[in-house]
Amino acid sequence: FERTRSLQDPCSNCPAGTFCDNNRNQICSPCPPNSFSSAGGQRTCDICRQCKGVFRTRKECSSTSNAECDCTPGFHCLGAGCSMCEQDCKQGQELTKKGCKDCCFGTFNDQKRGICRPWTNCSLDGKSVLVNGTKERDVVCGPSPADLSPGASSVTPPAPAREPGHSPQ
């Protein structure tokens, strides 16, 4: 089938990095500067992505692959292929419509992105608070008084936090 197709369609022989040039009797021409084709048999080359403004170039465009962008320091990528950049906050803060704001009492954020999450409720597991929480750190749960017998484990790490999402105020 491939042989038959290539006999019928000369463009199928054009490799990645080239395009099938209708203006030149369907011969394979190299992609022009600032363009690429990532698959064979293409009739046009795609324009390379330009990483401008808050975007930085992570990988240069080549004749066979698009440029890849990331974000300037102080910002992080969002969306498929880093389609957007969102500003970082400090640990102990979350990004809201009014900018970076400190986590409310009883919540924390240990990252530069995402939302403030409630401290672990140690008492739900019958534990006591061994180390108090802060804006930047969750509480550390310790044993309940009844567990303080010889040989008992002294510290239970808090349950893993869920993946931070983003919910502006």
Epitope: G53, S83, H166, S167, P168
Partner: nanobody, 123 residues
Framework: EVQLVESGGGLVQPGGSLRLSCAAS????????MTWFRQAPGKGLEWVAH????????YYEDSVEGRFTISRDNAKNSVYLQMNSLRAEDTAVYYC????????????????WGQGTTVTVSS
Amino acid sequence: EVQLVESGGGLVQPGGSLRLSCAASGFTFSSHWMTWFRQAPGKGLEWVAHIKEDGSEKYYEDSVEGRFTISRDNAKNSVYLQMNSLRAEDTAVYYCARGGDGYSDSHFGVDVWGQGTTVTVSS
């Protein structure tokens, strides 16, 4: 081509005023939140203000609240930043940026950025 072009920067004395403009082209302007950022010499980028698609919501960074006013004219595909009572610490390159799809509902990501206009506050 999607484009943002800022203008209106310049040298102004402390206490003075400037009005920055950002002209948008190549996209449906009225469908996007618009944002102003700034970058002072030797510092990182700082968010200044943003405005909802229809202009009904406006938010400001604490240090500019009450001195700066963001506005937009969707008929002219433009967003503005009126800056009053300027201080030396307002000296920066000011950038206009477009909020990406879903801005303010699920994120505050921007996807298009202007080239910037320089504001210098000095006596």
